[in-house]
Interface confidence: low
């Protein structure tokens, strides 16, 4: 939908700090299609760790960990001249806020270990 | 900090459905040192894109695209026998209800790819 | 520069225990993942332990319940106090880190550093 004229933007410094949010989510379906194995498949394969705290919305995160620090070859030997990493991404939560803990919160932001990639390592090239 | 007690967790049903979010957010540079070059050192680079939505905050969301089918091996030539694939994570936003717009924003879901990883593919065998 | 220095490895009658050490120096600014690996006469290098960031390990199967690892962030060590041992867990071992640092203002978000190794021996 095109902004409604003389709306300020969400990141400008005069929005109002203190915003309504209906919690009904849209899209809550979205991950209907997810159900991947990719964490076993993976040249870089990682662990899902549950995060959880119910202070917190959401209150459980699945965290990944990767499994070994070099890479599976296709041999599934583990070859230590490349490094299994994990992808980071930033995502907003809902801390509640302790003073008013029925409707009150504080947007937070977390960096979480989506899954993991497999990378050429850095050489450095010593004189 | 331990919940308060009496306070509904924010996923159950009796939660209020409407709550007061602080803008002001917490962890504002849990990025500060990512400055990570993943995607151009991975087996299976992706390119950026940049998603732009005014009505939503965060107003700007990075997508990962991963550029090649197969995955980049030692040599730098792109091997079909295994897949490049696109990990995904399911992150909140707060979408600007169209009615109020300068304080009333719902959650909403959105599916974002955040890096790729290089996989086996699935082998069926057929009879 | 980063360096990884072990200590503790020798000679353990089986039964006997052990603890090695490891130490991560350099300009570094975080230590994702620490651990060690051992690679026994003819074999190929295995894992043995990791601890995370966030404090969570993973272990082999052959160490499960023998072998405790642990890390002082502080310090930037990693340990590995093996119990129970058996003639089997004969090795050098190997102390590994995924460490992200700076070298000549750059700053590499990650890269693998490994250990110049220590040898335990368990006699039967």
């Known amino acids: 939908s095109p902004q409604n004229p003389g709306c300020p933007n969400a990141e400008d410094k005069n929005f109002p700090r203190t915003v309504m949010v209906n919690l009904n989510i849209r899209n809550r379906n979205t991950n209907s299609k997810r159900a991947s194995d990719y964490y076993n498949r993976s040249s870089s394969p990682w662990n899902l760790h549950r995060n959880e705290d119910p202070e917190r919305y959401p209150s459980v995160i699945w965290e990944a960990k990767c499994r070994h620090l070099g890479c599976v070859d296709a041999d599934g030997n583990v070859d230590y001249h490349m490094n299994s990493v994990p992808i980071q991404q930033e995502i907003l939560v809902l801390r509640r806020e302790p003073r008013h803990c029925t409707n009150s919160f504080r947007l937070e932001k977390m960096l979480v270990s989506v899954g993991c990639t497999c990378v050429t390592p850095i050489v450095r090239h010593v004189a | 900090s331990p919940q308060n007690p009496g306070c509904p967790n924010a996923e159950d049903k009796n939660f209020p459905r409407t709550v007061m979010v602080n803008l002001n957010i917490r962890n504002r540079n849990t990025n500060s040192k990512r400055a990570s070059d993943y995607y151009n050192r991975s087996s299976s680079p992706w390119n950026l894109h940049r998603n732009e939505d005014p009505e939503r905050y965060p107003s700007v969301i990075w997508e990962a695209k991963c550029r090649h089918l197969g995955c980049v091996d030692a040599d730098g030539n792109v091997d079909y026998h295994m897949n490049s694939v696109p990990i995904q994570q399911e992150i909140l936003v707060l979408r600007r209800e169209p009615r109020h717009c300068t304080n009333s924003f719902r959650l909403e879901k959105m599916l974002v790819s955040v890096g790729c990883t290089c996989v086996t593919p699935i082998v069926r065998h057929v009879a | 520069e980063v360096q990884l220095v072990e200590s503790g490895g020798g000679l353990v009658q089986a039964g006997g225990s052990q603890r090695l050490s490891c130490t991560a120096s350099?300009?570094?600014?975080?230590?994702?993942?620490m651990g060690w690996y051992r690679q026994a006469p003819g074999k190929q290098r295995e894992l043995v332990a990791l601890i995370f960031s966030g404090g969570s390990a993973d272990y082999a199967d052959s160490v499960k319940g023998r072998f405790t690892i642990s890390r002082d962030n502080a310090k930037n060590t990693v340990y590995l106090e093996m119990n129970s041992l058996k003639a089997e867990d004969t090795a050098v071992y190997y102390c590994a880190a995924e460490i992200g640092y700076y070298s000549g203002g750059t700053y590499y978000s990650s890269e693998a550093h490994w250990g110049q190794g220590t040898q335990v021996t368990v006699s039967s």
């Open positions: 350099g300009t570094i600014v975080n230590i994702h993942v």
